[in-house]
Interface confidence: low
Amino acid sequence: FNLSYPITPWRFKLSCMPPNSTYDYFLLPAGLSKNTSNSNGHYETAVEPKFNSSGTHFSNLSKTTFHCCFRSEQDRNCSLCADNIEGKTFVSTVNSLVFQQIDANWNIQCWLKGDLKLFICYVESLFKNLFRNYNYKVHLLYVLPEVLEDSPLVPQKGSFQMVHCNCSVHECCECLVPVPTAKLNDTLLMCLKITSGGVIFQSPLMSVQPINMVKPDPPLGLHMEITDDGNLKISWSSPPLVPFPLQYQVKYSENSTTVIREADKIVSATSLLVDSILPGSSYEVQVRGKRLDGPGIWSDWSTPRVFTTQDVIYFPPKILTSVGSNVSFHCIYKKENKIVPSKEIVWWMNLAEKIPQSQYDVVSDHVSKVTFFNLNETKPRGKFTYDAVYCCNEHECHHRYAELYV
């Protein structure tokens, strides 16, 4: 079998034990609480082992090398990076009971940045209180083989390059591996070496194809506008440099005095129409992207954008037409935090003449429509070259209006 562990585009967990250890030996005297969490691959939530802060157990373990495996590898042999002794590789068989009973020590998540230049691994220690008192270092050893031979493949130690991971926040370290564009489809082999208080934790060999783990940059240019048919159009553009189509997750919340609506939609286009929009409401929207047709990682969410609708919404907001034609305006009217029922809406032209009720239509409970038939040319009124069409609540008209140019 292939001795390297294939990384999926998810968070995964590293569990460690001293060589030749048994369950009873494993750090239990030092205050580690037993744990019976399952191994079903849900790695997002991790139970934090509890250590006493005296450090006595660490001094006992000084110079010990802990060999680590991934939770999903319980019943497999687990290969380690090349060891110091003559460049040979250890393959350790691990008792699966250990993994059922002892929760893991590290969460690891890796991805290729959206610019396709840097492969990043975040190594998060679950010994939250432990490493503040110890000299904590994380190194990532990696190799991009020129030619991948048949499995099993374990490069010799000398062929690995090492990067020092940035652990400015002690519990979370960032390891950056530069990947040439020409090698994005190649298999990257790597392993982690974590040192703390003289104890070395060593991961198994991991393999990954960077192109399958792209985390795009967040979508750009998120904006919203009301369409001529009264929908809210949410639009954005895909981030630059992504070499494949993306799917997008759009989450938006609508907040008005009458309703709070939240939605979460997956789309492959760079826009989304939201219907039944309400006047006097605010819409907060965020969007993120992920590879459409293969494995990948969701980008971070874009910066939230907020769009606020007016108390009176006209759609379309203006119409330009020719003499003799028929046109319609729609309106939704909100007054004193209530949406005016459409049957109570009246329409006025230029606040001077009431439009006959025969020209009204009730489209829905809240949407009123007025239609103009066989239109005459607009007569200029001072500097105004259009007719102002007002949607009113009985005798009270909002200052906003729609514009009719004939």
């Epitope: 940059d217 967040p218 750009l220 506008e225 009301i226 369409t227 553009s237 630059p240 910066t303 203006k318």
Partner: antibody, heavy 117, light 108 residues
Framework: QVQLVQSGPEVKKPGASVKVSCKGS????????ISWIRQAPGHGLEWMGW????????RFAQKVQGRLTMTTDTSTSTAYMELRSLRSDDTAVYYC??????????WGQGTLVTVSS | DIQMTQSPSSLSASVGDRVTITCRAS??????LNWYQQKPGKAPKLLIY???SLQSGVPSRFSGSGSGTDFTLTISSLQPEDFATYYC??????????FGQGTRLEIK
């Protein structure tokens, strides 16, 4: 190709208004917004405001809010910028710029507005 | 409002030189940064959008980098037509959209 063509230079007295037009061609006018940006002589760029060509939605810089009116006419693919109560420090070249997912990717040639008594 | 500060305000260089202009935002703007070139009497021209993406038609000697608060525009090998004023601009937090004060690039 995408082009934005602006109206010609204007000379105005303090307190007057000026209206500058910007005609777009080579793209679907209603799919984009138009921003107005000005540049006083020897100075940098100052964003004034933005209008969505499809919905008429607007955003303003605080400095000109209340004096600036932006409109669009999608039938002629033209955007208009009107600045009222002109002062001498409004003397500048006024630019329109197409504003989509890549802000200001195409610009008009600029319109010099001189405010002088 | 987010302030954009460019440095230097002006610099002199020769044809063939490698030139770097920096732009700093008063708060993090992610990658929502654009670079423009303006020649005397002309409208600005978009060079780089989203911090590092080259606008179509712009020569590859122009490149942008950075994210968060610190950004750079690099011209790898100056050509005679590159002498101009360069502006950075953020579109992260709007309104208002804000520009840097400009960097004037002159012939040495």
């Amino acid at each position: 190709q995408v082009q934005l063509v602006q109206s010609g230079p204007e000379v105005k007295k303090p307190g007057a208004s000026v209206k500058v037009s910007c005609k777009g061609s080579g793209y679907t006018f209603s799919w984009y917004g138009i921003s107005w940006i000005r540049q006083a002589p020897g100075h940098g760029l100052e964003w004034m405001g933005w209008i969505s060509a499809s919905s008429g939605n607007t955003r303003f810089a605080q400095k000109v809010q209340g004096r600036l009116t932006m409109t669009t006419d999608t039938s002629t693919s033209t955007a208009y910028m009107e600045l009222r109560s002109l002062r001498s420090d409004d003397t500048a070249v006024y630019y329109c710029a197409r504003t989509g997912t890549r802000p200001f990717d195409y610009w008009g040639q600029g319109t010099l507005v001189t405010v002088s008594s | 409002d987010i302030q954009m500060t460019q440095s230097p305000s002006s610099l002199s260089a020769s044809v063939g030189d490698r030139v770097t202009i920096t732009c700093r935002a008063s708060q993090s703007i992610s990658s929502y940064l654009n670079w423009y070139q303006q020649k005397p009497g002309k409208a600005p021209k978009l060079l780089i959008y989203a911090a590092s993406s080259l606008q179509s038609g712009v020569p590859s000697r122009f490149s942008g980098s950075g994210s968060g608060t610190d950004f750079t525009l690099t011209i790898s090998s100056l050509q005679p037509e590159d002498f101009a004023t360069y502006y950075c601009q953020q579109s992260y937090s709007t309104p208002p959209i804000t520009f840097g004060q400009g960097t004037r690039l002159e012939i040495k």
